[in-house]
Interface confidence: low
Amino acid sequence: WELTILHTNDVHSRLEQTSEDSSKCVNASRCMGGVARLFTKVQQIRRAEPNVLLLDAGDQYQGTIWFTVYKGAEVAHFMNALRYDAMALGNHEFDNGVEGLIEPLLKEAKFPILSANIKAKGPLASQISGLYLPYKVLPVGDEVVGIVGYTSKETPFLSNPGTNLVFEDEITALQPEVDKLKTLNVNKIIALGHSGFEMDKLIAQKVRGVDVVVGGHSNTFLYTGNPPSKEVPAGKYPFIVTSDDGRKVPVVQAYAFGKYLGYLKIEFDERGNVISSHGNPILLNSSIPEDPSIKADINKWRIKLDNYSTQELGKTIVYLDGSSQSCRFRECNMGNLICDAMINNNLRHTDEMFWNHVSMCILNGGGIRSPIDERNNGTITWENLAAVLPFGGTFDLVQLKGSTLKKAFEHSVHRYGQSTGEFLQVGGIHVVYDLSRKPGDRVVKLDVLCTKCRVPSYDPLKMDEVYKVILPNFLANGGDGFQMIKDELLRHDSGDQDINVVSTYISKMKVIYPAVEGRIKFSHHHHHH
């Protein structure tokens, strides 16, 4: 018996087609992805093959203005239109709190939404009961397939799930659910979830009875043969893991942003054992036409976005200096504003010992592309912010050693004075540079804001300590020459859309007046650490 699994993950509100790098589509003949194009390909495969499942491994939420305006209603509407068979909850599905998941998505989706390792307690338990499930048995042709879901247990640090959801260890939570499916005589089981490729492989190895793992969160691109676009494969598709009980378990993921449709064919014997598996992600490029009816629907929903982008989010009573003359040479108040928004967006009081889990932000000055003039009645719109942050990036959470941060700050000024983008703007950090010293030895003071304290204060950076830092995905990936971040980071979790983070902060504050306040200083006398 042959099953075709079609899968997406980490789509991050790319409902419309995008450019090759998943930013705004400029030249339509070269654009990719989008739900209208995805639907064309899915329908083509459904017509050609008998047993097809369309699955999503989480993080549909968050990423473009679509999510900012529609808050998840767009996800339910278009996933329903594409007739998804199941979805696992990702960490970003909790970005607007549990209510922001229940109302627009869980109550509106016509397909099961799954996670076995999230347990509700207190008053939420009855409210959310039945709206998401640990597993679902789906009839496919003449057979049944069990799908068990899982979600990153780091979600409380990455999003806003509140205090009434407990995120358990994935493997511990999955095993009893798989065992339950076995007792129901379901012998073909897919684990569908959102914990990253390393956890996907562990699940394949450790959870007895799982036949296939379909994952997300780490935006992993797997491919067999010559890859069709810019993404470099992390391994073959499917990636085969030998389980502890000796079975060969295929593990798949399909990069991110709806650029590819994962396509996996599995052959099962009559006892539900996997005999063979093969496939590849399908690049959704312009050779695949956009479905006209879905496209028309997208255009109808688009109208509200255009209206939204010119509405006032809040006001500034000071000039927001995002000029390259400032942000690439010294502390600029636009950099301070953005970093303050990044920290504010990551407030998670998950431990009484810590006022927050993260206090530090770094931001390459070259990523700030425009100032905002306060003399337009102080109005700030989404459109204004899109000029400041035009690259469609995310503000991510990383863990770095102090020694890596020190290298990053040395890199920040290694060729100071040439208006280069690597000069860092900061939050929760006080840095002093001495430019009379040679490159690589210019940081004379680096103090960081404590997290394990009731009154936050600045302490000297410790080289061997591990720190959490919020930064643009561009820096996490080693951009602007910050190779040391990419090479030495200990953990990296993708965050929220950059513009959305700043717009939410401005809406919350209503009136802003960021100052230049001595976060970055220059000195010619020598300090000692």
Partner: nanobody, 113 residues
Framework: QVKLQESGGGRVQTGGSLRLSCAAS????????MYWYRQAPGEQRQLVAL???????YYVDSVKGRFTISRDDSKNTVYLQMNDLKPEDTAVYFC???????WGQGTQVTVSS
């Protein structure tokens, strides 16, 4: 296993040009910053130029305006176009992704006056 193969060196007169190539394997080339270094006899290896995954470039002052670094992600190759060569450019030239990887053999550039 990272493998780096430099080529294109040679002997030229002052004011001449060379184009160095470096073919890389075993790395996720398109998401990696690539560097050119050089080592003159009896001296430490020093950075010449780098190009990030987004195509941003950096040059040391001594080569600025004369050398151009570029990359072709489809070929997993980084190039160094060297114009207006001077005797002080004489060195073995190496490419690398992460400084700290094993080095390739390098390619010798000799500029005679």
């Amino acid at each position: 296993q990272v493998k780096l193969q430099e080529s294109g060196g040679g002997r030229v007169q002052t004011g001449g040009s060379l184009r160095l190539s470096c073919a890389a394997s075993g790395i996720s080339f398109s998401i990696t910053t690539m560097y050119w270094y050089r080592q003159a006899p009896g001296e430490q290896r020093q950075l010449v130029a780098l190009i990030t995954d987004r195509g941003n470039t950096y040059y040391v002052d001594s080569v600025k305006g004369r050398f151009t670094i570029s990359r072709d992600d489809s070929k997993n190759t980084v190039y160094l176009q060297m114009n207006d060569l001077k005797p002080e450019d004489t060195a073995v030239y190496f490419c690398n992704s992460i400084p700290g990887n094993d080095w390739g053999q390098g390619t010798q550039v000799t500029v005679s006056s």
